[in-house]
């Protein structure tokens, strides 16, 4: 978790002098509770936006927006703590809006936004906005949270972001798999424009079951430049096991930008349809 272009962070708006600060996610008001605390944020909204760094890279960011409730506690609002927790790693990053002037009611509802948390493809985050100071131990909570899932690199808008392109999102191998006679599969896919090797991982399963009955790995050496964007054809020999008929073919590239961690593409061949067995015809017809 990180912030995009930290020096450009702004939270001031007409009628409010405000500064964005790094936060330890442990506000002072936890340790030194105040008697009077503000109410919780209203109408927390999170969207996926895209932002360029000064180097021209494009990153997905969480756009966080919320409004203030129109009650008197606005007079005791000193700021807000924004927290983003990545759920699979428990990594947390916080920033603090510090209000340098007192808020006053005005004709429009106060609205705040922040779009600088860089998020990763296919990750889920808990996004929390805490009004400050935080409540006393038995006080009503004054925060709002939402769990936000970022689309993966298959998503059309994500595909062109720097992290997705680095993991090979622009490569479309257009895999085709056909079953040949004599227990063989022909796998065909389009090579990318990089001199790097590939690996084909074949996993076979029985019909309607999810434990594998055959596994095989096939190495494809790095293509020469004249072979870039050409089709590569590989014939794989299957184990002659009755009922081991559903095959998943996965192609793993080893591009320089992502090495062992590139996006994999896969295709599946289903078991052949079994024809309905007709009722056996008796060879004699009983008379009674």
């Amino acid at each position: 978790l990180r912030l995009l272009d930290h020096r450009a962070l702004v939270c001031s708006q007409p009628g409010l002098n405000c500064t964005v600060k790094n936060s330890t996610c442990l506000d002072d008001s936890w340790i030194h509770p105040r008697n009077l605390t503000p109410s919780s944020p209203k109408d927390l909204q999170i969207q996926l936006h895209f932002a360029h760094t000064q180097q021209g890279d494009l990153f997905p960011v969480a756009h966080i927006e919320w409004t203030l409730q129109t009650d008197a506690s606005i007079l005791y609002l000193e700021g807000a703590e924004l927290s983003v927790l990545q759920l699979n790693t428990n990594e947390r990053l916080c920033v603090r809006f510090e209000f340098l002037s007192k808020l006053r009611h005005h004709h429009r509802r106060w609205r705040f936004t922040f779009s600088h948390f860089v998020v990763d493809p296919d990750q889920e985050y808990e996004v929390t906005v805490h009004h400050l100071p935080k409540p006393i131990p038995d006080g009503d909570p004054n925060h709002q949270s939402k769990n936000f899932l970022v689309p993966d690199c298959e998503h059309a808008r994500m595909k062109v972001t720097t992290p997705c392109m680095s993991s090979g999102s622009l490569w479309d191998p257009n895999i085709t798999v056909e079953t040949l006679e004599a227990h063989q599969l022909r796998v065909s896919f389009t090579l990318w424009n990089e001199s790097t090797h590939y690996q084909i991982l074949l996993t076979s399963f029985p019909h309607m079951e999810n434990h594998s009955c055959f596994e095989h790995m096939h190495h494809i050496p790095a293509p020469r430049p004249e072979e870039f964007h050409q089709r590569s054809n590989v014939t794989l020999t299957l184990r002659n096991l009755k009922g081991c008929c559903r095959h998943q073919v996965q192609i793993q590239p080893f591009f320089s930008s992502c090495l062992n961690d590139c996006l994999r593409h896969s295709a599946t061949v289903s078991c052949p349809e079994m024809p309905d067995t007709p009722e056996p015809i008796p060879d004699y017809m009983p008379l009674w």
Partner: nanobody, 126 residues
């Protein structure tokens, strides 16, 4: 312009099933999370279910969990709601709605739903 058209509502007996459909047009359907929201007679709006852009994540309101199934077919620009074991309290106008921004929030919407259908009426009565 964005259009969402629901269909499949009707009068059904308690315990029976219905399948609602929503045909979408005017936007890139497979970019966005989609939702079903309902409004019972004389009540406010209630979020029913949501589905992420690629069907990878799905959420349901507690009141319909285990009975309703949301799905989508991006090739057909369509959203569906399979409703089983219907109860009288499921009687409502059912709306299909599009998430305003990209991304998906479990257990509800990430923010505003910026486009809505006209609704399809589901009446559960014996």
């Amino acid at each position: 312009q964005v259009q969402l058209v629901e269909s499949g509502g009707g009068l059904v007996q308690p315990g029976r099933s219905l399948r609602l459909s929503c045909a979408a047009s005017g936007f890139t359907f497979d970019d966005y999370a989609m939702h079903w929201v309902r409004q019972a007679p004389g009540k406010g709006l209630e979020w029913v279910s949501g589905i992420s852009w690629n069907s990878g994540s799905i959420g349901y309101a507690d009141s319909v969990k285990g009975r309703f199934t949301i799905s989508r077919d991006n090739a057909k620009n369509s959203l569906y709601l399979q409703m089983n074991s219907l109860r009288a309290e499921d009687t409502a106008l059912y709306y299909c709605a599009k998430e305003k921004g990209l991304g998906y929030c479990s257990g509800g919407t990430c923010g505003d739903l910026d486009n809505w259908g006209q609704g399809t009426l589901v009446t559960v009565s014996s």
